[in-house]
């Protein structure tokens, strides 16, 4: 991915900026969390090393009525080259266990921070 649209600033956004904004949003979610995130809703755990952005979106898109992660869902859609809709989960994707959204966000944040430090913006 060389440019991404639909984020805070207008027009094309450099991948490093888009990734930083996604990280900032996830930090915001984890720091502002008081009650259980998304009422304790659970999502499919994903492999963070393979097709992560689309897989993360496919998992999180199934959480409805949770305003806290709506921005994250929109931002992830900018990283995923194909359209993802609720209920869609590739049969090739592992569906092994569900974890709470809060744990999912925390793990995703840790992984994205690692990618950012290593300069892997795409």
């Amino acid at each position: 991915l060389t440019c991404l649209g639909g984020f805070a600033s207008p027009g094309p956004v450099p991948p490093s900026t888009a990734l930083r904004e996604l990280i900032e949003e996830l930090v915001n979610i984890t720091q502002n969390q008081k009650a259980p995130l998304c009422n304790g809703s659970m999502v499919w755990s994903i492999n963070l090393t393979a097709g992560m952005y689309c897989a993360a979106l496919e998992s999180l898109i199934n959480v409805s009525g949770c305003s806290a992660i709506e921005k994250t869902q929109r931002m992830l859609s900018g990283f995923c080259p194909h359209k993802v809709s609720a209920g869609q989960f590739s049969s090739l994707h592992v569906r092994d266990t569900k974890i709470e959204v809060a744990q999912f966000v925390k793990d995703l944040l840790l992984h994205l921070k690692k990618l950012f430090r290593e300069g892997q913006f795409n």
Partner: antibody
Framework: QVQLKESGPGLVAPSQSLSITCTVS????????VNWVRQPPGKGLEWLGI???????DYNSALKSRLIINKDNSKSQVFLKMNSLQTDDTARYFC??????????????????WGQGTSVTVSS | DVQMIQSPSSLSASLGDIVTMTCQAS??????LNWFQQKPGKAPKLLIF???NLEDGVPSRFSGSRYGTNFTLTISSLEDEDMATYFC?????????FGGGTKLEIK
């Protein structure tokens, strides 16, 4: 200690529905998934479905139209309802806890504790 | 659905023998395999999870390994109490599916 115990009707008439209760102790239903698995006499095991800690469910697609799994967290009970029973639904029905662990890059599940099962015969 | 082909369907071995049985997945990568032991009239008991992790309280003579989509359960020195039927389960692709079982008898 962790325990699961199934209770069911034993005998069900063809075309009728089956209701089984799994009562658990030693863990909270909000923190674990609970599976339903069945085993026809002398045969192998078949996964029916799971209810997760948040109450969401996933079913075996082959049986999805006939199954409902729900639970009462406060009573530590999980319920299986199966409609339109036929003789080939005769089996021992088990509930089993699903425990999460981290493996191969992400979270996985394992069926670590099982109930002793309840036998269901479909016959007129 | 992912089919789990388990072999052999039955086997007979002597006390102290090394026993192996296998499960092969029809498709899928990164499969989380569980192995269970079931004795007549009893519930299945978890032995191995994640293909090679020994469940707490399970004797160390049981071990699991994986090579691609092939999974093996090995009993290093067969004991009388190991007479049972063994099932594998793939816990990774819905619907989760079990192998047909391997019935182990003592010679």
């Amino acid at each position: 200690q962790v325990q699961l115990k199934e209770s069911g009707p034993g005998l069900v008439a063809p075309s009728q529905s089956l209701s089984i209760t799994c009562t658990v102790s030693g863990f909270s239903l909000t923190g674990y998934g609970v599976n339903w698995v069945r085993q026809p006499p002398g045969k192998g095991l078949e996964w029916l479905g799971i209810i997760w800690g948040d109450g969401s469910t996933d079913y075996n697609s082959a049986l999805k139209s006939r199954l409902i799994i729900n639970k009462d967290n406060s009573k530590s009970q999980v319920f299986l309802k199966m409609n339109s029973l036929q003789t080939d639904d005769t089996a021992r029905y088990f509930c089993a806890r699903d425990k999460t662990f981290y493996y191969d890059g992400f979270y996985r599940g394992r069926m670590d504790y099982w109930g002793q099962g309840t036998s269901v015969t479909v016959s007129s | 659905d992912v089919q789990m082909i388990q072999s052999p369907s039955s086997l007979s071995a002597s006390l102290g023998d090394i026993v192996t049985m296998t499960c092969q997945a029809s498709q899928g990568t990164s499969i989380n395999l569980n192995w269970f032991q079931q004795k007549p009239g009893k519930a299945p008991k978890l032995l191995i999870f994640g293909a090679s992790n020994l469940e707490d309280g399970v004797p160390s003579r049981f071990s699991g390994s994986r090579y691609g989509t092939n999974f093996t359960l090995t009993i290093s020195s067969l004991e009388d109490e190991d007479m049972a039927t063994y099932f594998c389960l793939q816990h990774s692709y819905l619907p989760w599916t079990f192998g047909g079982g391997t019935k182990l008898e003592i010679k």
